[in-house]
């Protein structure tokens, strides 16, 4: 298989000049490093910071949404070290960690007014912040928390460079005083968990302090990453010495603590993944160990399997895993050059971003019980990383996509098998972002975000789809790169879409490209399963072309066909007439065959032999309709583009188009009737419909008004009967 390559779909969308200036002001000082990340929430934000300057931009357009320059209490301005999106009481904002000469400050920043509304001092140097909950009180929505935490109103986990883990009360029940970062409140740290939390909290708040629970006192080892996993109710804490800890927020106890395989390398990021319907209540946590910009060159991904005693669905609809039974490393992937052949010696590999994407099947497709906790039918983790190679000016950037369900299908190997590379792996797909680097150089990439809603596999080329269709290399998606100067959009297409695009571009020279095009379609899993075991050399060019045309129709790649037709008509190549005749005949034969198949499938709808249609048959009928609809578009293209054609030829062509159009409408009506429950037609007509499938009063009003109109127009000569 060839390498997959991302395509840039926009130029650089630069940040406003005012943003660039504000961020550039502090770049001269050593401590001021430009940091930038896409916010994980649904508000489409990206946050950039340099020294005391914070800039919040629209992640799609790059326009400035909010900005703030933090003030300090002494000559040295504070440095923005950590930023996390946070919403509370219908307000959208950020939790921000500032480093000062003496300790740190946690700020609650309101994006709506571009102001700090709450601030509290913290001990040490904050390295990460993670919201646990944005409200409080003993309500059903806080049942998963330790009783002591339920007395707090809004909780944020804060970690420091000396290993301290704090759970801070944000006091969201008291927003009476608007504080800025200079006026930060005091903090009272509780080491144990006292019984009288409400009483203590009231007293502490009266004294103008925030309460906080210390999960871990300073150990001297910096915390390098922090993530709250709501589905397991665990706080995942990664340390700079390669250890990972999991803290349960119900018991407020540490459930797991282990050093990952790459040893004393910081755990730089974690992300959660849940497979589809694991009967053992297993879910997974990726832990990424990375040296990033420091000495050494390590970037390794570790997949931890967490097995739980119970998996339940809360009243809110949220899934919750309970009772951790074990946690063990199940898969490791080293991304520092060895796993895929690179020319040259790598000097530094660093992670740019990691995220998990889940998609749940729509309600209509589900067979599970209503109260059963649903699992995602799509679950992928996306990793982006940058490889700097000695002697090369530009870095190489890659995007990898791990599909956990395909990993299950591959029987859960613990690493890549010998001779297996990332670009030919059945559960991991790899895209090169070379085009992005070329287009954006010398601007550094700060983060990459895949747009969840854009992730799709496209249309299956056949039913049942071939094995290759399920590999992650068939995914198509859009993403955005956050640079130090703006944003750039890109699209990643899978092998199938890329193959179809290749064919589309081949244009009039199709005849010369048939063997290559056929082979590409075969490898990409675009052809009917019957071609899998057939040697391409044993097929004629016509048969190969028919297979390619079928793939285009099945996958709704109509631009490919209509593009050929238009070009052959206008460019009049030597083979144009032959090609047009061949494609027209093939299209019409396909209409006939599909109509016959459709009629065969519909027999049980009308002969009273069945009372309901199984999902498989409904799917086949829908597939027939889709094919008929696509074929109709192709015939429509012939009809509208036809030139220098005999009268008889034109009549024949328009007849074909009209007939296919009517068949298409008929198929649409049949589908509507079966969706409405009016088909299949039972022998026993006394069977009551569960609900009226059409709105009688609306229809009655419509026809009454039409009758009145006709009577008016006919001046009494029209007989409504």
């Amino acid at each position: 298989m060839r390498d997959l390559r991302a395509q840039v779909t926009s130029g650089l969308l630069p940040f406003p000049e005012v943003t660039l200036q504000a961020l550039g002001e502090d770049e001269i000082t050593l401590e001021s490093v430009l940091r930038g990340k896409f916010a994980a929430g649904k508000n489409g934000l990206a946050c950039l910071a340099c020294g005391p300057q914070l800039e919040v931009v629209n992640s799609i357009t790059g326009e400035r949404l909010s900005a703030y320059r933090f003030s300090g209490v002494n000559e040295q301005p504070p440095v923005v070290l950590a930023v996390k999106e946070f919403s509370w009481q219908k307000r959208t904002g950020l939790l921000i960690g500032l480093e000062e000469t003496e300790g740190s400050v946690l700020c609650l920043y309101d994006l709506g007014i571009s102001k700090v509304v709450k601030a509290v001092v913290l001990p040490g140097r904050v390295t990460a912040i993670e919201p646990i909950i944005n409200h409080g009180g003993a309500s059903a929505s806080t049942q998963h928390l330790h009783p002591s935490l339920r007395w707090l109103f809004g909780v944020a986990a804060v970690v420091t460079d000396v290993g301290q883990i704090l759970l801070v009360d944000l006091c969201l029940d008291d927003l009476s005083c608007n504080q800025n970062e200079v006026e930060a409140s005091d903090l009272e740290v509780l080491t144990g968990i006292p019984a009288e939390v409400p009483h203590i909290r009231e007293s502490v708040m009266r004294q103008g302090r925030h309460l906080c629970f210390q999960l871990v006192s300073p150990t001297g080892t910096a915390v390098s990453t922090l993530s709250y996993i709501s589905r397991t109710n665990q706080l995942a804490v990664g340390f700079s010495d390669g250890y990972l800890a999991l803290w349960n927020m119900k018991s407020m106890k540490r459930e797991y603590y282990i050093q990952l395989e790459s040893g004393q390398v910081p755990v730089y990021a974690v992300t959660f993944q849940e497979p589809e319907n694991d009967p053992r209540n297993c879910c997974y946590l990726w832990a990424v160990q990375s040296t990033q910009d420091s000495e050494g060159d390590v970037l390794s991904l570790h997949l931890l399997q967490l097995a739980f005693g119970n998996r339940k669905c809360l009243a809110s609809g949220q899934i919750l895993y309970e009772g951790l039974e074990y946690c063990e490393e199940r898969y490791t992937l080293d991304l520092t050059g060895g796993m895929f052949p690179l020319r040259g010696q790598t000097s530094n590999t660093k992670l740019l971003g990691c995220q998990s994407i889940e998609k749940f099947r729509s309600h209509g497709d589900r067979e599970e019980g209503v109260n059963e906790a649903l699992s995602p039918d799509t679950s992928v983790s996306v990793f982006t990383w940058q490889v700097n190679i000695y002697g090369q000016g530009k870095p190489s950037v890659y995007l990898g996509l791990f599909d956990i369900n395909r990993w299950y299908h591959a029987q859960m190997p613990d690493s890549l098998r010998s001779g297996e590379y990332l670009h030919n792996c059945s559960y991991f797909a790899l895209w090169s972002l070379e085009s992005v680097v070329s287009r954006t150089s010398p601007h550094g990439i700060l983060d990459i975000l895949v747009h969840e809603r854009s992730l799709n596999r496209g249309v299956p080329p056949s039913y049942p789809p071939p094995e290759q269709f399920f590999n992650p290399s068939t995914y198509n998606f859009d993403a955005t790169c956050l640079l130090n100067s703006g944003v750039v959009h890109l699209t990643c297409t899978g092998f199938q879409k890329e193959t179809l695009t290749f064919l589309k571009k081949s244009g009039p020279s199709l005849n010369e490209l048939i063997p290559d095009g056929y082979n590409r379609c075969l490898v990409a899993g675009l052809l009917s399963p019957r071609f899998v075991d057939v040697q391409p050399s044993s097929l004629s060019q016509e048969e190969q072309l028919e297979a390619i045309l079928s793939a285009a129709i099945q996958t709704s790649s109509l631009g490919l066909l209509t593009g050929y037709i238009r070009r052959w008509i206008t460019e009049e190549q030597p083979n144009s007439a032959t090609n047009l005749r061949f494609v027209l005949e093939w299209t019409w034969n396909k209409v006939v065959l599909t109509k016959e198949e459709f009629d065969r499938l519909c027999v049980p709808l009308f002969d009273g032999s069945c009372h309901f249609m199984d999902p498989q048959t409904i799917q086949s009928i829908q597939q027939c309709y889709l094919l008929l609809s696509n074929l109709n578009i192709v015939l429509s293209c012939f009809a509208s583009e036809a030139r220098e054609i005999t009268e008889r030829g034109l009549i024949d062509l328009s007849n074909k188009f009209v007939v296919s159009h009517l068949i298409c409408q008929y198929a649409q009506v049949v589908l509507w009737f079966s969706h409405s429950g009016l088909l299949p037609e039972g022998i026993d007509d006394s069977v009551q419909l569960s609900r009226l499938c059409y709105n009688y009063p609306v229809i009655q009003n419509y026809y009454t008004s039409r009758r009145q109109k006709f009577e008016r127009l006919s001046r009494g000569k029209w007989n409504p009967d």
Partner: nanobody
Framework: QVQLVESGGGLVQPGGSLRLSCAVS????????VSWIRQAPGRGLEWVSK????????AYAASVKGRFTISRDNAKNTVYLQMNNLKSEDTAMYYC?????????????????RGQGTQVTVSS
Amino acid sequence: QVQLVESGGGLVQPGGSLRLSCAVSGVDLSRVGVSWIRQAPGRGLEWVSKILNNGTNTAYAASVKGRFTISRDNAKNTVYLQMNNLKSEDTAMYYCAQGLVQDSQGLVLSSRIRGQGTQVTVSS
């Protein structure tokens, strides 16, 4: 830049009184809470008293309650600590501070900003 400057310390006999002052600059006193903390020889920093930004809410450590009174003058941007009935165990360096991290026993773990301090010695 926020600055805190303490004054008023000195040598006093047990049972005597002293009034410490803390001149605040760089921030509006009506917007921040200010604390007095102290450090006795060979001991950690101990929280003594606090006055909140509203000026009415005050708090005291159990060891000084009833003997010490914290107040402020917003016009002069100054915080005061009136210390009566002083005991030998009150001997310490007294600091005016803002932005404290402390434990439930009143031990000060860190302070965001504090003055140079003023020495109070209670001795006969």
